[in-house]
């Protein structure tokens, strides 16, 4: 090999040994029989030298240094070339660098042709190899603007003061051109200005100076975002930190097209604007940080760009003014992530800050909208709170468990409606009366309806899960001690059409000791099925529920358990059932942990099944699952 | 375990020639390159040479250029120095050493040594 | 050919000092500069490599440091088992070469 650097070409080249490999073997650069380890080429010298060994590439990189000053003299702007041509370098991955230094009042500005950079974080490489490491300065100071790869949105940067600009090649690369061209410009008064320009839809991520470092301190820097007027720009900020300052505030500040209110201030903890119509800019300003403990501001956001979506001109009003004790939150429903681009799903408050997911609370009237390409990746989940604190006041008190006609009109399927209902410890318990009688989920009988009523405690400490219930059944009431939630859960979106169906009223009722009463009116033709809370987990320690199991005087009741031993083992005290006529208070009781459970029995008036548990040994639990059938009492049951 | 174990102590008379050998265990010197470093009583070290075994091509330090030969048997995985036409300033300690290009571009193994003593 | 000077040629120190042994090249090496411990009737170890890197198992007192043609190694607190003889070599260029080396006793 021979390079030749011309006199005052300002370029140094340098040979030097590179990322060690699992090679053992040295390879060296041999200069007239010498073996040396690196070599530098200055300008005005003329080296020949080869290596020792077969693949230099897997030992050796050259780097190529060009300083140019545009301090002294005129500046060499336009196309940047790559000098020496890498037609006539070894084949070894080459970084070339320009050192430009210039005065604090003049701008430089990179230009970078199609195709434009794409910024890339700290761990990530570049899929071709290529990369462009940027940088600048403040008096003496380096600031690393970032590192970019080919096929992103950025076209321009404008710095002062100087730039380092660094493109690797790697060994086996074509590439012959550098790629950009310099352009002086006036004083930027700021750190650097990033241009970004979106053809189309997609999106770009973007750091501050020196990131994942702290940027600069008391620095501005701005991103120009070039979006086409049809298309809609939003931002969210991906990760952020925050110095302390002694002085100012860290802030963004936004121009955006139509905005009353330029620069629209923010700060880093804020919700950022989203649907954005056209170009606009975003400012990072820091702060005098404190001397002792400066901290550090940093930022990665992402600009998302896409088609606006026809709900995004449609403003929803959700009135939330008479409701307390609220909220309700519209998320992205759970996905599997793809690796394609998928356009941004957002919801937006009075259409301008968007998020992926949005809050609304309870006394005020909230306007929203969307900006996203399909809507079912999106749901809404409720929660209110009912609760009394007075007994005396609350007593047989009613409240309608339904869900606001507002909430079922946006275009968002509800996927949870979350009422919370509190009573006061040991004075009050509720009842639960619905619309329509309800239908305990099983494996043997599975809801098929597009909602379900959860029914669970809600005392923090206790694991008791009444069951799934659906309308269209045989109960015809639930009686619970405390405090429970219930949770309207939605399965398909035909609820739209049957939430006509639902109604569920709680009334606060004089307190009693069972954990929960089941009120069962079955209807002839069809076979009740009815299980255990906490079904799979078994029933709580020292639970006790019951089922008031109503015979019509034309008929007669099967009652049937479907396993032959309870299966509980008891650690301490007795689990047992009670079943009890209710006319005649005659009563059977089983011990669940010793007998085998009852066969098939009929009844030929209402009553009673109550099932109450010990402290069972773990893994021996307490699940049972019983039906009951009615049949015309005028057939012989002999 | 890498180990290089170096032949024995040799007296030998001004004008002799003398072969040292160095066999290597726990590698293959096809892999790495082999140096020889001479030190002589009571002075510092003085680098003699290298060998790539797997080609036998060898670089010395011009002052043991026909000095010192550098060979290499990779069958047996042994590398030898011979040394020609000795007198008193030979006498010294020699070693060998495994070169590691790969992180170090440095002597990571070494021999016990062998003396060479030169005497009439 | 690249001379290496190694000073002092002798050191004597007590155990918990801090000792500093310097190698000069007479031309820019670039860091290929290697530390070499040999202690009384053993053949060299590998101390450090690339001027500053410890090679596995070399404990945290030594350190390398240096650039252009000055380099430094350090013993931040003398051990007893650290008399030897310390070499600089340099690997930038053939022929290899050493520093004169530098004896450290213990008083």
């Known amino acids: 090999f021979e390079i030749a650097l011309p006199r005052e070409s300002n370029i140094t080249v340098l040979i030097k040994l590179g990322t060690p490999t699992l090679l053992a073997k040295p390879c060296y650069i041999v200069i007239s029989k010498r073996h040396i380890t690196m070599l530098s080429i200055k300008s005005g010298e003329r080296i020949v030298f080869t290596f020792s060994c077969q693949s230099p590439e897997n030992h050796f990189v050259i780097e190529i240094q060009k300083n140019i000053d545009c301090m002294s003299g005129p500046c060499p702007f336009g196309e940047v070339q790559l000098q020496p041509s890498t037609s006539l370098l070894p084949t070894l991955n080459r970084t070339f660098i320009w050192d430009v230094k210039a005065h604090k009042s003049i701008g430089l500005e990179l230009q970078f042709s199609i195709p434009r950079l794409r910024q890339i974080g700290p761990g990530e490489s570049c899929p071709d190899g290529v990369t462009h490491s940027i940088s600048g300065r403040i008096d003496a100071t380096v600031v690393r603007i970032g590192t970019f790869c080919s096929n992103g949105t950025v076209s321009r940067i404008k710095m002062q003061e100087g730039v380092k600009m660094a493109l690797h090649l790697p060994w086996f690369h074509p590439r012959n051109v550098s790629g950009f061209s310099i352009a002086n410009r006036s004083s930027i008064k700021r750190l650097c200005i990033i241009e970004s320009v979106f053809e189309g839809e997609g999106s770009a991520t973007l750091m501050s100076a020196n990131y994942p470092e702290g940027f600069p301190e008391d620095e501005l820097m701005t991103w120009q975002f070039v979006v086409p007027a049809h298309l809609r720009a939003s931002v969210s900020f991906l990760n952020f930190n925050l110095s302390n300052c002694e002085r100012k505030e860290e802030r963004v500040e936004y121009y955006i097209p139509g905005s009353t209110t330029n620069p629209e201030v923010f700060k880093l903890e804020d919700k950022q604007p989203g649907n954005m119509a056209g170009n606009f800019n975003l400012s990072l300003q820091g702060c005098d940080q404190d001397a002792q403990s400066p901290g550090i501001l940093r930022l990665q956001f992402q600009v998302l760009v896409q088609h606006p979506q026809n709900e995004s001109n449609k403003i929803y009003v959700v009135d939330l003014s008479n409701e307390r004790a609220m909220s309700l939150t519209i998320e992205p429903r759970p996905v599997k992530q793809s690796r394609k681009f998928v356009p941004g799903c957002f919801v937006c408050l009075e259409s301008r800050t968007c998020s992926s997911n949005l809050t609304l609370t309870s006394g005020s009237k909230h306007k929203i909208s969307f900006l996203c390409d399909d809507l079912t990746r999106l749901w809404m989940n409720v929660e209110k709170t009912i609760s009394c604190t007075d007994h005396r006041y609350c007593q047989r008190k009613s409240y309608s468990l339904q869900v606001p006609s507002d909430i079922l009109h946006l275009p968002v399927e509800l996927h949870d409606f979350s009422w919370k209902l509190l009573v006061p410890k040991d004075r009050l318990s509720l009842v639960l009366v619905p619309a329509q009688k309800l239908q305990q989920h099983t494996h043997e009988k599975p809801c098929n309806t597009s909602f379900s009523y959860l029914v669970a405690s809600a005392i923090p400490s206790q694991d008791l899960y009444f069951g799934s219930f659906c309308p269209g059944g045989s109960i015809k009431q639930i009686q619970v001690k405390q405090n429970i939630s219930v949770t309207l859960r939605t399965f398909a979106p035909s609820f739209q059409q049957e939430a006509s169906r639902q109604g569920l009223t709680v009334s606060f009722i004089p307190y009693f000791k069972e954990e929960g009463v089941f009120t069962v009116t079955p209807d002839t033709k069809s076979k009740v099925y009815l299980r255990t809370p906490n079904w799979d987990r078994g029933l709580p320690s020292l639970t006790s529920v019951s089922w008031n199991i109503s015979v019509p005087r034309d008929q007669v009741a099967c009652l049937t358990f479907f396993k032959e031993r309870s299966g509980v083992v008891c650690q301490t005290g007795r689990a047992f059932m009670i079943i009890q006529e209710q006319r005649t208070r005659a009563e059977e009781i089983f011990s669940l942990d010793e007998d085998v459970l009852p066969k098939p029995s009929f009844h030929h008036h209402s009553f009673w099944v109550n099932i109450s548990n010990c402290s069972p040994t773990s893994g021996k639990q307490l699940d049972l699952l019983f039906s009951v059938t009615l049949t015309p009492r005028t057939v012989d049951l002999t | 375990e890498v180990t290089l174990k170096e032949s024995g102590a040799e007296l030998v008379r001004p004008g002799a020639l003398v072969k040292l050998s160095c066999k290597a265990s726990g590698f293959n010197i096809k892999d790495y390159y082999m140096h020889w470093v001479k030190q002589r009583p009571e002075q510092g070290l003085e680098w003699i040479g290298w060998i790539d075994p797997e080609n036998d091509n060898t670089i010395y330090d011009p002052k043991f250029q026909g000095k010192a030969s550098i060979t290499a048997d990779t069958s047996s995985n042994t590398a030898y120095l011979q040394l020609s036409s000795l007198t008193s300033e030979d006498t010294a300690v020699y070693y060998c050493?495994?070169?590691?290009?790969?992180?170090?571009?440095?002597?990571?193994?070494w021999g016990q040594g062998t003396t060479v003593t030169v005497s009439s | 050919d690249i001379v290496m000077t190694q000073s002092p040629k002798f050191m004597s120190t007590s155990v918990g000092d801090r000792v500093s042994i310097t190698c000069k090249a007479s031309q820019d090496v670039s860091t290929a500069v290697t530390w070499y411990q040999q202690k009384p009737g053993q053949s060299p170890k590998l101390l450090i490599y690339?001027?500053?890197t410890r090679h596995t198992g070399v404990p945290d007192r030594f350190t390398g440091s240096g650039s252009g043609t000055d380099y430094t190694l350090t013993i931040s607190s003398v051990q007893a088992e650290d008399l030897a003889l310390y070499y600089c070599?340099?690997?930038?260029?053939?022929?290899?070469?050493f520093g004169g080396g530098t004896k450290l006793e213990i008083k």
């Open positions: 050493a495994r070169f590691y290009g790969s992180y170090y571009y440095a002597m990571d193994y």
């Open positions: 690339w001027a500053s």
């Open positions: 070599q340099q690997h930038y260029s053939t022929p290899y070469t």
